[in-house]
């Protein structure tokens, strides 16, 4: 048995680390392998995760970590039974893919404008809160070449724009990810979408 | 309440020994890295040593490395400090203190202290 | 084996300003952990600050921690009578535990 992948890791930079490899053919990742993980501190203890299959050859495990702080380092070892298959180390804030935005919400009852709000994933004492910054998908059901992005560079976590910029009469969708800048992250999942009805008074036309 | 209380303190002569207990209320000690720290009368902060959750590793500062074995009894949840070789300057307050591993090191419960004095 | 300096030895400063104490490394600790104590007479130390920057439960947002590298800094925005004491920077590294010597805060 052997790794053909080596495991890469990615940090929430909250509570969890996900890591993935490949091995060089089909396994029962949860009776095969442990993977331990221990973070660099005098007189911390290793911790076991326990993986689950990832496809054929593939294995995840997510490592569960009690809080993050930039220092955090962390030795792995992932074994086969008493065979040490591979050692090596990850840091959690060199590798970051923040948790995806929640609980997006469409007002479409202000005057013509749409405001689109959702929450931010993190609790107020967790370093990534204030460094949010947002990107919005809006897209037609109808048209997919009706399909456009809104970069939120500000830390609110809401996005304004004209109804009338969109079709009207017509179903749209919409969706936001995430990412921070301060630690070059990756940019988190899309949050689940949410629909509305795209529905705006057209201006008189002046004779 | 999360509590530590430290006994066992007294006068000793030089090259004596004295076992120091730290009794834990409040919380489970099998859960915590714990620690041994002193203060000399007058001076500053010293760490003196300290003992993994489960008790399999341990650490010693220097200065008492070879006199001094910490241990852990986590059903009863106590820490122990066995002092041995005692000298004058071990002279101190000790504080038993416990470290959160989410606080990265920080020691967020002190004891009040046990005083240790080694004098003939 | 890394040795913690602060500056002032001692700091005096009146209710209402702001205190700046220092922690200097005598080597780089990208991978360990800063944290900062205040111990009043007769006292065992309180946790202020850890990992650098985080305060601890309860502590007021008038504690600030900063720093990397090897400076360290704890800022005290605006002073309180009950902030005048001794503060002590303690590095918790993979392999040692050290305090520095420690910095008195007196009321001018």
């Known amino acids: 048995m052997k790794v053909l992948q080596e495991p890469t890791c990615v940090s929430d930079y909250m509570s969890i680390s996900t890591c993935e490899w490949k091995m060089n053919g089909p396994t029962n990742c949860s009776t095969e392998l442990r993977l331990l993980y221990q973070l660099v501190f005098l007189l911390s203890e290793a911790h076991t995760c326990i993986p689950e299959n990832n496809g054929g050859a593939g294995c995840v495990c997510h490592l569960l970590m009690d809080d993050v702080v930039s220092a955090d380092n962390y030795t792995l070892d992932l074994w086969a039974g008493q065979q040490l298959l591979w050692k090596g180390s990850f840091k959690p804030s060199e590798h970051v893919k923040p948790r995806a935005p929640g609980n997006l919400t469409v007002h479409t009852n202000v005057s013509d404008t749409l405001l689109l709000t959702w929450s931010n994933p993190y609790p107020p004492d967790n370093y990534l809160y204030n460094h949010l910054t947002y990107a919005v998908n809006i897209w037609s059901e109808n048209d997919p070449a009706d399909f456009r992005i809104y970069n939120v560079t500000y830390l609110e976590p809401s996005l304004r724009i004209a109804a009338s910029t969109l079709k009207s009469g017509i179903s749209y969708r919409a969706r936001v990810r995430a990412w921070a800048q301060c630690y070059n992250t990756t940019w988190s999942e899309w949050s689940p979408s949410t629909k509305w009805h795209n529905s705006y008074r057209e201006p008189f036309e002046q004779h | 309440e999360v509590q530590l209380l430290e006994s066992g303190g007294g006068l000793v002569q030089p090259g004596g020994s004295l076992r120091l207990s730290c009794a834990a209320s409040g919380f489970t000690l099998s859960s915590y890295a714990m620690h041994w720290v002193r203060q000399a009368p007058g001076k500053g902060l010293e760490y003196v040593s300290g003992?993994?959750?489960?008790?399999?590793?341990?650490y010693y500062a220097n200065s008492v490395k070879g006199r001094f074995t910490i241990s852990r009894d986590n059903p009863k949840n106590t820490l122990f400090l066995q002092m041995s070789s005692l000298r004058a300057e071990d002279t101190a307050v000790y504080y038993c203190?416990?470290?959160?591993?989410?606080?990265?090191?920080?020691?967020?419960?002190w004891g009040q202290g046990t005083t240790v004095t080694v004098s003939s | 084996e890394i040795v913690l300096t602060q500056s002032p030895g001692t700091l005096s400063l009146s209710p209402g300003e702001r205190a700046t104490l220092s922690c200097r490394a005598s080597q780089g600790i990208s991978s360990a952990y800063l944290a900062w104590y205040q111990q009043k007479p007769g006292q065992a130390p309180r946790l202020l600050i850890y990992g650098t920057s985080r305060r601890a439960t309860g502590i007021p947002d008038r504690f600030s921690g900063s720093g990397s590298g090897t400076d360290f800094t704890l800022t005290i925005s605006r002073l309180e009578p009950e902030d005048f004491a001794v503060y002590y920077c303690?590095?918790?590294?993979?392999?040692?535990?050290?305090f520095g010597q420690g910095t008195k805060l007196e009321i001018k």
């Open positions: 303690q590095l918790y590294g993979a392999t040692s535990v050290t």
């Open positions: 003992i993994s959750p489960s008790g399999v590793s341990t």
């Open positions: 203190v416990r470290v959160k591993v989410k606080y990265r090191g920080g020691m967020d419960v």
